[in-house]
Interface confidence: low
């Protein structure tokens, strides 16, 4: 029998640094935990203790944080190159910056394959992109070979940047001619590692002939057996087995998300190529475990230049913003208005002659506004200021909902009215009248919504029956400030970008600003 | 702290092919946060990258010198080499190794040089 | 290949004075460039990384600024070990190419 060791991560979004343990800020150094220089200490201690060992990632390294913003992936790059890291597959992320913004930091300066098979280019770019990215990989291990295979998410286009010389199939459908292929080589190990989510990895298992181990990405799930170390709930077992259509066992993993946790997994395999066994966890990557001194001290290094970053100037306001809590937690608010036009514009994607766009509506807790922006500043705003503001370091995410759902959402909004709690909602996209003069839970009187398939948009009734997409923080996805009918009743979740850096990309595009109350909420007495 | 030294001959003839290693003390090539690069200046004139190598082998070649360049590893040695076939008397140049950190690819630490002479 | 093009390519300053060198790239490299100061006779030694980060161990005299296609090395009061010259390096795209130089002399 012959062991593979496999090591993986998923989903870090730029927590270069070590974060605290909820994937924010550090603020107490002892607690904190993740980041790439404590990551090194772990994967450098298994490679001198284990013979056959792999470091893979499955993708949406970009986007998260500062230092993705200013380095747009050239940290990426240099650090995963610096820990040594075998392959990797794209992630929907790793187009938020366009085609360019991927080949020339990340794929061109990559020391690793970074692989994805149902990604297809044409046009001029398919000459351009060449080689650049693969759909598999052989690699020797010891005196084996292992073939690595990728895959994205299909929902690529509509979460990300791609442009229009990328195709992107369907993952099955892609992935078995290559792993075919694979078999023609005489490779009998074969590693499907790819980010479209954790029911997609799952079919790959039980679909594709010949893929051994699924390595995920995408949904941020944790798996664990036993007692889990950390906060977060497990899925499932690690690694989850599927029983494949042909009869095999196949394990699956995805190690949650940020650099929290390294995945850590142990495959037996016969002479044969098939799989005798695996087991593992994922490893827990707390204070316990020393930051690399090498490692931080480049940390260090690169960081000089995001604290300089932050004070500059973004673009201006030459309005006040308000985003105190007695305005965005009672009515509608600018600030409000503000951080939702630029959520929706984030997430402008003209796919479908059909749609001006495929999402008009978002929707954001009041009590996640946390500072107003004062424009007597000389009306600066800085990544500093918006901060402030965003201080939770959360994403903007693309939902799924029925109808019924955001009614119910927008009744939570208003259920305890006038205690300043933080589910009042502010709105893109969305005109809502509230009555509060009728019983909790009945208090949306008008709910109007902005149509996408459409080439003039205007305001119609909201359908209860209806699927809508909606722009969201993750917060609220994950049934935040009481909103768990969002959690509970969704239909999809994609998670977006990081607040603040969809919020200074829109104020540095539009240069200044000056968004105002124009009644997308208002309230009301009386009969309608 | 890490020093790289150039060797090799001082003259070669045209249409030979010159040969140059340089030794990295004081750290390892196996550092993967950087890899190693071949430079050289003509007398008199600016600076030309010839190439780069990763500590697992990856090269890459400047195009105006691909067809006559090989640079190797040998991680056993703390070694990389340069090899330049067919050489005229334009590649007479002060030859420069150097380690370039990845990301920027800012060039960190330098050899002192060694003086490439192609003459008959 | 991008094209790296400095200016002036020589210059005369004495002790004390500002200075400030141009490297101009032929198309958008962002903020990867990198500037050298060559001695005669010696390596070059890196300054600035990044367009405008100064490298450890670099008096603070010494500053790089600039993205797209305009970068500048601007050194605040020249002092006698300054007399140089200085190359530019774009690390953008492949190969990677340096400017011509520009050679600080004492006037």
């Known amino acids: 029998a012959w062991e593979l060791t496999i090591l993986h991560t998923n989903d870090v979004h730029s927590r270069l640094e070590q974060t605290s343990e909820d994937s924010s800020k550090c603020v107490n150094a002892s607690r904190c935990m993740g980041g790439v220089a404590r990551l090194f200490t772990k994967v450098q201690q298994i490679r001198r203790a284990e013979p056959n060992v792999l470091l893979l990632d499955a993708g949406d390294q970009y986007q998260g944080t500062i230092w993705f913003t200013v380095y747009k992936g050239a940290e990426v790059a240099h650090f995963m190159n610096a820990l040594r890291y075998d392959a990797m597959a794209l992630g929907n992320h790793e187009f938020d910056n366009g085609v360019e913004g991927l080949i020339e930091p990340l794929l061109k300066e990559a020391k690793f394959p970074i692989l994805s098979a149902n990604i297809k280019a044409k046009g001029p770019l398919a000459s351009q992109i060449s080689g650049l990215y693969l759909p598999y990989k052989v690699l020797p291990v010891g005196d084996e070979v292992v073939g690595i295979v990728g895959y994205t998410s299909k929902e690529t286009p509509f979460l990300s940047n791609p442009g229009t010389n990328l195709v992107f199939e369907d993952e099955i459908t892609a992935l078995q001619p290559e792993v075919d292929k694979l078999k023609t080589l005489n490779v009998n190990k074969i590693i499907a590692l790819g980010h479209s989510g954790f029911e997609m990895d799952k079919l790959i298992a039980q679909k594709v002939r010949g893929v051994d181990v699924v390595v995920g990405g995408h949904s941020n799930t944790f798996l664990y057996t036993g007692n889990p170390p950390s906060k977060e709930v497990p899925a499932g077992k690690y690694p989850f087995i599927v029983t494949s259509d042909d009869g095999r066992k196949v394990p699956v993993v995805q190690a949650y998300a940020f650099g929290k946790y390294l995945g850590y997994l142990k495959i037996e395999f016969d002479e044969r190529g098939n799989v005798i066994s695996s087991h593992g966890n994922p490893i827990l990557l707390n204070s316990s475990i020393p930051e690399d001194p090498s490692i931080k001290a480049d940390i260090n290094k690169w960081r000089i230049k995001l604290d300089n970053y932050s004070t500059q100037e973004l673009g201006k306001t030459i309005v006040y913003l308000d985003g105190s809590s007695q305005s965005c937690r009672f009515r509608e608010c600018n600030m409000g208005n503000l951080i939702c036009d630029a959520m929706i514009n984030n997430n402008l994607r003209h796919t479908d002659e059909m749609f001006w766009n495929h999402v008009s509506m978002c929707i954001l807790n009041g009590g996640g506004i946390r500072s107003p922006i004062d424009e007597r500043n000389n009306g600066t705003i800085t990544w500093e200021n918006l901060a402030a503001v965003l201080p939770f370091g959360g994403t903007f995410d693309l939902v799924q909902l029925k109808g019924s759902t955001l009614k119910k959402a927008f009744e939570h909004s208003v259920h305890r009215y006038g205690q300043s709690t933080g589910e009042f909602l502010q709105v893109g996209g969305i005109h809502v009248v509230y009555d509060l003069s009728r019983k909790p839970g009945d208090r949306v009187v008008k709910l109007d919504v902005l149509c996408t398939k459409c080439r003039v948009p205007s305001y119609d009734p909201l359908k209860m029956d209806e699927v809508y997409k909606v722009i969201l923080p993750n917060f609220l996805a994950n049934g935040g400030d009481g909103f768990q009918m969002i959690k509970d009743e969704l239909l999809r979740h994609d998670s977006g970008d990081q607040d603040i850096n969809v919020v200074s990309t829109y104020i540095s595009k539009m240069k200044v600003i000056y968004p105002a109350v124009e009644g997308r909420i208002k309230f009301s007495t009386g009969s309608h | 702290q890490l020093q790289l030294q150039e060797s090799g001959p001082g003259l070669v003839k045209p249409s030979e092919t010159l040969s140059l290693t340089c030794t990295v003390s004081g750290g390892s090539i196996l550092s993967s946060s950087y890899y190693w690069v071949w430079i050289r200046q003509p007398p008199g004139k600016g600076l030309e990258w010839i190439g780069s190598?990763?500590?697992?082998?990856?090269?890459d070649y400047n195009p105006s010198l691909k067809s006559r360049v090989t640079i190797s590893v040998d991680t056993s040695k703390n070694q990389f080499s340069l090899k330049l076939s067919s050489v005229t008397a334009a590649d007479t140049a002060v030859y420069y190794c150097?380690?370039?950190?990845?990301?920027?690819?800012?060039?960190?630490?330098w050899g002192q040089g060694t003086m490439v002479t192609v003459s008959s | 290949d991008i094209q790296m093009t400095q200016s002036p390519s020589s210059l005369s300053a004495s002790v004390g004075d500002r200075v400030t060198i141009t490297c101009r790239a032929s198309?958008?490299?962002?903020?990867?460039l990198n500037w050298y100061q060559q001695k005669p006779g010696k390596a070059p030694k890196l300054l600035i990384y990044a367009a405008s980060s100064l490298q450890s161990g670099v008096p603070s005299r010494f500053s790089g600024s600039g993205s797209g296609t305009d970068f500048t090395l601007t050194i605040s009061s020249l002092q006698p070990e300054d007399f140089a010259t200085y190359y530019c390096?774009?690390?953008?795209?492949?190969?990677?190419?340096f400017g011509g130089g520009t050679k600080v002399e004492i006037k």
């Open positions: 198309q958008s490299i962002n903020s990867y």
């Open positions: 190598i990763y500590y697992s082998g990856g090269t």
């Open positions: 150097a380690r370039v950190m990845s990301g920027w690819l800012d060039l960190d630490v």
């Open positions: 390096q774009q690390a953008y795209a492949r190969p990677r190419t």
